[in-house]
Interface confidence: low
């Protein structure tokens, strides 16, 4: 909140403030205004104006300080490349309009990195990555010249530096100076030149924050070897002993506004939820501030690692809490964080140097009192011994993310506060916090938390198998009889769970093909283990041609699976992994898990089906309440079951029933879906409750899933809670921690 904004309400007239081709809206009870233009246009010459003490609006000045009489909306242009080394770009033009494209080409002997073709986007930024022509002659790879910046320095040996500058009127985001480091990476982060009208889209923010706040839950060493021209993948270690402190710092000053404050709270709630879904427990600190900071949660509090409790505290914070003292003292807020980090009597506790600290600051960057907050960041770095020892700079132990919210964001201020790390972005400018909410839940990259069950890489760039990493495709080749296709689920490094009816006793291991992670190669099978009570011919004498009770099998693989982003286990009921996934207390019993996952009601669930070579999630409802009986009775419409007197002869207590039209019209399974998991999605994790066994109606004749299906089209799945003793016995060496 700049001092000039703190004036009595309505002291500036609105006469003549209109903008040609757009509109304006008042901020801060009439003490500021923001010009709003249609998509593809920006307000010229300024985006915001402030009401001065003289009772007049701040003048309309261009970047070169010329005064303009009337504001207007002008078409957004993307900046042109000032320099492009060792190659050419085409077409060359003094400016580029939205949707214009440019192409980059390298001279002989140079190789192009980044994007060869880039498009001018509606927000004034070029799509893709900085194009760089490099001959690999440097110790570090060429750091490139992001479009719109100018680079000084063209030597890329160890300890060489390059500096970047922006044209007048543009603000540099990222690192102005970068140094070639041992190992071939550049210090800092790639710079860019920002115009005041430029915002990060929710997708950009999600993606950049997502890939930066990467963590390995298993506690992999953060120092990765890598060479020139390669980006080092930095990993923040979130280990179960809670060696990470996350400080949530929320600006509650006048200039932020109530709606952005509420939006920011929602985003942080999502962030806490997402972190908690890993089964790890970082400690949280929670600070809001205006003229003074208010600490709501201290990292030293016993409950600071209890995600639900921290969320409750966050939800209870009111924007009005800072109303009477509504300046913006970011320095004091960060000092509150510093106080939480420091230790009594200056005696560092055991393990202080293994604790990683993440500060997430949501502000408009307009500190107007208390002095420059950057000094506190320096003090924090000092306290944590960061950047002092060249051999061990410990940069991984502090991350400062700054989210600039709203039109008054001071880009210089927020850039100064944020961390600068190679190939990462720590500073974001968002137009309106609410449009972030839908993507904020994505913002932690689970790509390294590999052995956690039921974990999914929810990312827009993710493939089918990033989104269903447990899914296995099974086919059985039978000479002269064609082949059978089924699905299965990875449940451990050596086992895939599927349906027994996918196989016959005559099937040899070598004729069974299993693939996971979307990989082309088939896995070698050691053995298929059937449930001992499965016998498809068990009731033939009673006139039941096929009997699917206990229709489950485990495929044991010869070689251990290598978990990765596209290959991960699903959670099984009554395991410790599921207890953690559901964030239940460690003392949780199997029965309590069952009540959580299969309550006596309609239960939202899903299965995964392959359609036109794509895996898709199908949402269904398990009828486990008052609709259960009618669901099971519809089994009589299945071919061969029409003569069955008592339906419980075929629908045993081992089955779960889905399908039908109530409460919603459920999609049905197809033949090729057999053996796949029936899944309950809870708390951002996926828990298998059933194995797809059989259906009443073949809704997929001629390879096409029929849209119109009868109400009696039901599907039956083996309830895993009913085959637990067998699972426990067969998977006893798999470290799943059965309860």
């Amino acid at each position: 909140t700049p001092w000039s904004l703190a004036r009595p309400q309505g002291s500036c007239s609105l006469e003549g403030v209109e903008i040609k081709g757009g509109s304006f809206r008042l901020l801060q009870e009439g003490q500021a205004l923001e010009y709003v233009c249609p998509s593809g246009f920006y307000p010229y010459p300024v985006q915001t104006r402030t009401c001065r003490s003289t009772g007049s609006w701040s003048t309309l000045k261009t970047q070169d300080q010329k005064t303009v009489r009337k504001a207007e909306c002008r078409a957004i242009h993307c900046p042109r490349p000032h320099d492009f080394e060792n190659g050419e770009y085409w077409p060359r033009s003094p400016y580029y309009n939205v949707s214009d494209e440019i192409s980059f080409h390298c001279y002989d002997g140079y190789t192009l990195r980044g994007s060869a073709n880039r498009t001018c986007q509606v927000n004034g930024r070029w799509s893709g990555q900085t194009a760089i022509c490099d001959n690999g002659a440097g110790y570090c790879s060429n750091p490139g010249i992001p479009i719109g910046t100018r680079k000084v320095g063209s030597q890329y040996r160890l300890e060489d530096s390059v500096t970047y500058h922006c044209s007048r009127g543009l603000t540099l985001r990222g690192s102005q100076r970068r140094t070639c480091q041992e190992g071939g990476s550049w210090s800092g982060t790639e710079p860019s030149c920002q115009d005041s009208f430029m915002y990060d889209t929710p997708q950009e923010v999600a993606e950049a924050f997502l890939s930066s706040l990467t963590e390995t839950i298993e506690g992999v060493d953060a120092e990765d070897g890598h060479g020139p021209g390669e980006q080092q993948k930095r990993k923040i270690v979130l280990d179960p002993s809670g060696s990470m402190n996350i400080y949530l710092v929320l600006d509650g000053s006048d200039s932020i506004g109530a709606s952005n404050f509420t939006g920011a709270k929602k985003c942080l709630v999502n962030l806490i939820e997402k972190v908690a879904s890993y089964g790890v427990k970082p400690r949280y600190g929670l600070v809001t501030y205006a003229t003074y900071p208010k600490i709501w949660v201290k990292v030293s509090e016993a409950d600071s690692s209890n995600a639900d409790w921290v969320t409750k505290q966050l939800n209870e914070i009111n924007y009005e809490d800072h109303k009477l003292k509504s300046g913006t003292n970011t320095k004091k807020a960060l000092q509150a964080v510093y106080s939480m980090m420091s230790w009594p009597d200056d005696v560092p506790p055991e393990g202080w140097n293994r604790t990683r600290h993440v500060i997430i600051l949501m502000t408009d960057g307009l500190h107007n009192m208390g002095g420059d907050p950057i000094t506190v960041i320096d003090e924090i770095r000092d306290l944590l011994y960061i950047g002092k020892d060249r051999k061990n700079p410990r940069e991984d132990y502090l991350d400062v993310y700054v989210f600039g919210v709203g039109p008054l964001v001071n880009q210089v201020n927020i850039n100064a506060l944020a961390s600068k790390k190679d190939n990462e972005q720590h500073v974001f400018k968002v137009k309106d916090m609410e449009n972030l909410e839908d993507v904020f839940y994505q913002m932690i990259d689970e790509s390294q938390s590999l052995s956690l069950c039921g974990m999914v890489w929810e990312h827009r760039k993710g493939t089918d198998y990033h989104k269903q990493p447990w899914q296995a495709k099974i086919s059985v080749i039978r000479p002269s009889k064609g082949h059978e296709s089924c699905m299965g689920a990875v449940v451990s490094e050596y086992f895939v769970l599927t349906a027994a009816h996918c196989f016959t006793v005559d099937d040899k291991e070598h004729s069974i093909k299993v693939s996971v992670g979307g990989e082309k190669r088939d896995l070698e099978i050691e053995v298929v283990l059937f449930h001992p009570n499965y016998n498809i011919n068990g009731k033939k004498e009673a006139g039941i041609p096929e009997f699917y009770d206990y229709d489950v099998a485990l495929i044991k693989l010869k070689n251990k699976l290598k978990y990765g982003q596209t290959i991960r286990p699903i959670c099984l009921p009554c395991t410790e992994g599921t207890t953690r996934a559901l964030r239940l207390p460690p003392t949780t019993t199997c029965q309590q898990q069952k009540e959580e996952l299969l309550p006596a009601q309609d239960i939202k669930a899903l299965f995964v089906s392959e359609e036109e070579k794509k895996l898709t999630r199908k949402e269904v409802y398990i009828k486990n309440g008052d609709k259960k009986g009618s669901c099971e009775r519809d089994a009589q419409y299945a071919p061969g079951y029409d003569k069955v007197k008592d339906i419980s002869e075929v629908v045993t207590p081992r089955f779960l029933c889905t399908g039908g039209v109530s409460p919603y019209a459920d999609p049905n399974t197809c033949r090729g879906d057999s053996g796949g998991p029936l899944i309950v999605h809870k708390r951002s994790r996926f828990i298998q409750v059933g194995v797809i066994s059989w259906g009443v109606v073949d809704v997929c004749k001629n390879q096409k899933r029929q849209k119109q299906v009868p109400a009696h089209a039901r599907d039956f799945h083996i309830n895993l809670f009913q085959v637990l003793p067998w699972l426990k016995e067969k998977l006893q060496d798999e470290d799943l921690g059965f309860l």
Epitope: G136, A137, G138, Y139, Q155, R157, L158, E159, D160, S161, E182, G183, G184, D224, G225, H226, G227, P228, G229, E230
Partner: antibody, heavy 120, light 113 residues
């Protein structure tokens, strides 16, 4: 203890190819570039190029471009250097070497060398 | 490519005496911004791979006796053995890493007089 163990001596005819292996132990193979240097009999040392075992990315000296191929098998922590279209002046001892850091230019660890003799 | 020229080609020095080997580069190896020289010295004994002695022109590798020292800047560099020992008989190479390709000198053979 860091160790680089190379394959045994080879005798090749001109025009043929040779593939020398270098098995690493005592450290994380994928964390450090593997560099290849050769030394003709009674001559000096000559840098041939490097491979990044993590990504498989390579950088070759211009002199060997088109004739040299560096590969690796991370499952057995082994780097390979294949030189094709051999000539008599390719007779040399071929060394693999590793620096202190991921891509350090200072070669602190060396293999014992593999003598390749090219003779008709 | 940067050419490295060592002198002399061979050198005979009495035990306990000082040995000096020179290395000249065809262009400066000094990074004026960091004041570092991109040069290393290696020792190679018969039938053995080379051994790193000095890097950054003057930084002694750990475990290397302090009788070995490196000096020089820009294009002219020197390796000095202050008091020659019998085990120092070897060929010594300088190497530049200022630019790719990294290049070595032709070597200097050090013998005992």
């Amino acid at each position: 203890e860091v160790q680089l163990v190379q394959s045994g001596a080879e005798v090749k005819k001109p025009g043929a190819s040779v593939k020398v292996s270098c098995k690493a132990s005592g450290y994380s193979f994928t964390d450090y570039y593997m560099t290849w240097v050769r030394q003709a009999p009674g001559q000096g040392l000559e840098w041939m190029g490097w491979i990044n075992p993590n990504s498989g990315g390579t950088k070759y000296a211009q002199k060997f471009q088109g004739r040299v191929t560096m590969t690796r098998d991370t499952s057995i922590s082994t780097a390979y250097m294949e030189l094709s279209r051999l000539r008599s002046d390719d007779t040399a001892v071929y060394y693999c070497a590793r620096g202190y850091y991921a891509n350090s230019a200072w070669f602190a660890y060396w293999g014992q060398g593999t003598l390749v003799t090219v003779s008709s | 490519d940067i050419v490295m020229t060592q002198s002399p080609d061979s050198l005979a020095v009495s035990l306990g005496e000082r040995a000096t080997i020179n290395c000249k580069s065809s262009q400066s190896l000094l990074n004026s911004r960091t004041s570092k020289n991109y040069l290393a010295w290696y020792q190679q004994k018969p039938g053995q791979p080379p051994k790193l002695l000095i890097y950054w022109a003057s930084t002694r590798e750990s475990g290397v006796p302090d009788r070995f020292s490196g000096s020089g800047s820009g294009t002219d560099f020197t390796l000095t053995i202050s008091s020659l020992q019998a085990e120092d008989v070897a060929v010594y190479y300088c190497k530049q890493v200022y630019n790719l390709p990294w290049t070595f000198g032709q070597g200097t053979k050090l013998e005992i007089k």
